[in-house]
């Protein structure tokens, strides 16, 4: 632990003014693991002037960073790039004349306290004024900047010509695309200072490339994957003052696939579990020993979880007997194609068959094994996937 600092397994604090620290505290190799440090408190360190790009990166678990009553003048743009857990930053009473929003844009900060710094009135700090205006009143700070006459001016009164928030407008075609096809999105940005344009595609799987020239940009997505259905694509305009974005959701249509079909399991009911993917929503049809299976209140399809274009469910059977043993085929179909899979189901042995000689039969015995299950006595239901037991749980990825 550096002189003038104290270190515990989760905290570093440097408060002793002399000799003080001249650089951001770093832990010695083979001492405390920097990843476990959640709080760094620095006070009275007049010779600490800079936070370099790599000073803080080792402290990936850092949540609270406090540097107060010190000499901080400059913070490198990428200083906090690796510190995604940072929630509270306090730079009160330092020597900061400017601070860019680029330092913090990737962080989900609860607090950014900057009072008592000699900020210069310029477009560089207009983002702070914007930030103050969007905050609820109890959280606002008395921030000031020094104007051309070196007079302290409340940031709330700061007016800088040609210094405003940018705008982004996405000209997107109908973003419903068939799997394997391509699409191009166009975006125009504007503002003063002139913003930069970039695309936020999140975790898009499909191959994509962008072209940007000044205030226009295009994003071409090729050989679109069904995995990208429901994902959001954003065009972002960013300048010194802040950012604006325009977003579209991608809908990918594709033929159904049955990704999972298993032998029956017994819980409250018997269940033949399945997972089907497809968009638009596929219609499901069951076949029993090759013939259409007419569903009833004793044997029916239940969808338990819907995850955008993926459906997890069961063919649910109430008290099946040996009469229900056989081959079950699931067919999923939409306008782009169909898929089918089959499993063999064995619910129970025929009456009078000794279990000992049939070890493959499941260990399930029903007292009233002669009761029929009433299958086949109803007309075939709608071939759309029935409404779910569990509410739609669309997990959209951003």
């Amino acid at each position: 632990c550096p002189t003038s600092c104290k270190c515990s397994s989760a905290r570093i604090w440097c408060t002793e003014p002399s000799p003080g620290i001249v650089a951001f505290p770093r832990l010695e190799p083979n001492s405390v693991d920097p990843e476990n440090i959640t709080e760094i408190l620095i006070a009275n360190q007049k010779r600490l002037e800079i936070i370099n790009e790599d000073d803080v990166e080792a402290y990936v678990g850092l949540r609270n960073l406090t540097i107060v009553d010190s000499g901080l003048k400059f913070v490198a743009y990428k200083a906090f790039l690796k510190n995604s857990n940072l929630r509270h930053i306090n730079f009160t009473r330092n020597k900061l004349t400017s601070l860019s929003r680029r330092h913090f844009r990737h962080l989900d900060l609860s607090d950014l306290i900057l009072t008592g710094n000699p900020f210069t009135c310029s477009c560089d700090i207009m983002w702070l004024k914007t930030l103050q205006e969007t905050k609820s009143s109890p959280d606002t700070q008395d921030l000031y900047c020094l104007n051309e006459s070196s007079k302290n001016m409340p940031l709330a009164n700061l007016q800088i010509p040609n210094c405003g928030l940018p705008s982004a407008r996405l000209a997107a075609p109908n973003l419903t695309v068939e799997e394997g096809k391509s699409v191009t999105l166009s975006c125009s940005v504007g503002g003063d200072p002139l913003p930069t344009l970039y695309w936020d595609v999140g975790n898009l799987v499909s191959k994509h490339m962008n072209e940007t020239s000044h205030t226009q940009g295009s994003l071409r997505i090729t050989n679109i994957s069904s995995d990208d259905s429901g994902k959001q694509i954003s065009c972002v305009a960013e300048n010194l003052v802040g950012e604006d974005q325009d977003s579209v959701n991608l809908t990918v249509h594709f033929a159904p696939t049955i990704t999972f079909l298993e032998s029956p399991t017994s819980d409250h009911h018997w269940c033949i579990p399945f997972t089907v993917r497809g968009n638009p929503k596929p219609a499901l049809q069951w076949f029993y020993n090759g013939a259409i299976l007419n569903e009833s209140k004793y044997i029916c399809t239940k969808i338990h979880v819907t995850n955008h274009t993926e459906y997890h469910g069961c063919l649910q059977l109430d008290n099946p007997t040996h009469m229900n043993n056989g081959d079950y085929t699931l067919m999923a179909k939409n306008e782009y194609g169909k898929d089918e899979r089959q499993i063999s189901a064995h619910f129970m042995g025929r009456p009078g068959v000794d279990y000992e000689t049939n070890p493959n039969y499941p260990e399930v015995l029903y007292e009233d094994w002669t009761t029929p299950t009433d299958i086949g006595d109803t007309t075939n239901k709608s071939n759309e996937i029935p409404s779910t037991d569990v509410a739609d749980q669309s997990n959209r990825e951003h």
Epitope: T15, K46, K95
Partner: antibody, heavy 116, light 110 residues
């Protein structure tokens, strides 16, 4: 060489004001904290407060907060300790000291006598 | 006001080794560095030990410092008559946001 030179002894009456000085030389005066220490006759050392001449930031001991004012003029590399209204109990030797690795450089001391 | 506690006096004969203790709390000695000062009669204090156990140049190696928990100590070996002085410990106190001195120890060389 690095040194701190303090102003001469003072004899004052209760209620009077006083400002004593401590001039640094031989080092970057604005880059080190300067502290003031009181020693009453026959007693131990008492830390009063510090100032960072680079930006005049000060810290006071709770015992001396509001009783004295510490200031600095970086243009002439001088730190000050002042009283607006002296009391007999302010009679003491006052030292200034540079804070680095410990208080490594001390002034020779200024004797302040307050008597009616 | 919290101060660091030292024995009021200590003594030893020439050549002997004496130790002066300095007891504090977690907010000062326990969490910060300790320095030691020697004040010869009629003189300004002089830095003897900094950062718990470091000697400035010019200070004889007969003087050594150590710290354990919330206590620190100054050891003087091979005691000499010119070591007769007052000795003070000091440390930054986090709860006060300021320095604190010890009560002082008067060392007599018999």
């Amino acid at each position: 060489q690095v040194q701190l030179v303090q102003s001469g002894a003072e004899v004052k009456k209760p209620g009077e004001s006083l400002k004593i000085s401590c001039k640094g030389s031989g080092y970057s005066f604005t880059s080190y904290w300067i502290g003031w220490v009181r020693q009453m006759p026959g007693k131990g050392l008492e830390w009063m407060g510090i100032i960072y001449p680079g930006d005049s930031d000060t810290r006071y001991s709770p015992s001396f907060q509001g009783q004295v004012t510490i200031s600095a003029d970086k243009s002439i590399s001088t730190a000050y300790l002042q009283w607006s209204s002296l009391k007999a109990s302010d009679t003491a030797m006052y030292y200034c000291a540079r804070h680095d690795y410990g208080m490594d450089v001390w002034g020779q001391g200024t004797m302040v006598t307050v008597s009616s | 006001l919290p101060v660091l506690t030292q024995p009021p006096s200590a003594s030893g004969t020439p050549g002997q080794r004496v130790t002066i203790s300095c007891s504090g709390s977690r907010s000062n000695v326990g969490g910060n560095t300790v320095s030691w000062y020697q004040q010869l009669p009629g003189s300004a204090p002089k830095l003897l030990i900094y950062t718990n156990n470091q000697r400035p140049s010019g200070v004889p190696d007969r003087f050594s410092g150590s710290k354990s928990g919330t206590s620190a100590s100054l050891a003087i070996s091979g005691l000499q008559s010119e070591d007769e002085a007052d000795y003070y410990c000091a440390a930054w106190d986090d709860s006060l946001n300021g320095y604190v001195f010890g009560t002082g120890t008067q060392l007599t060389v018999l």
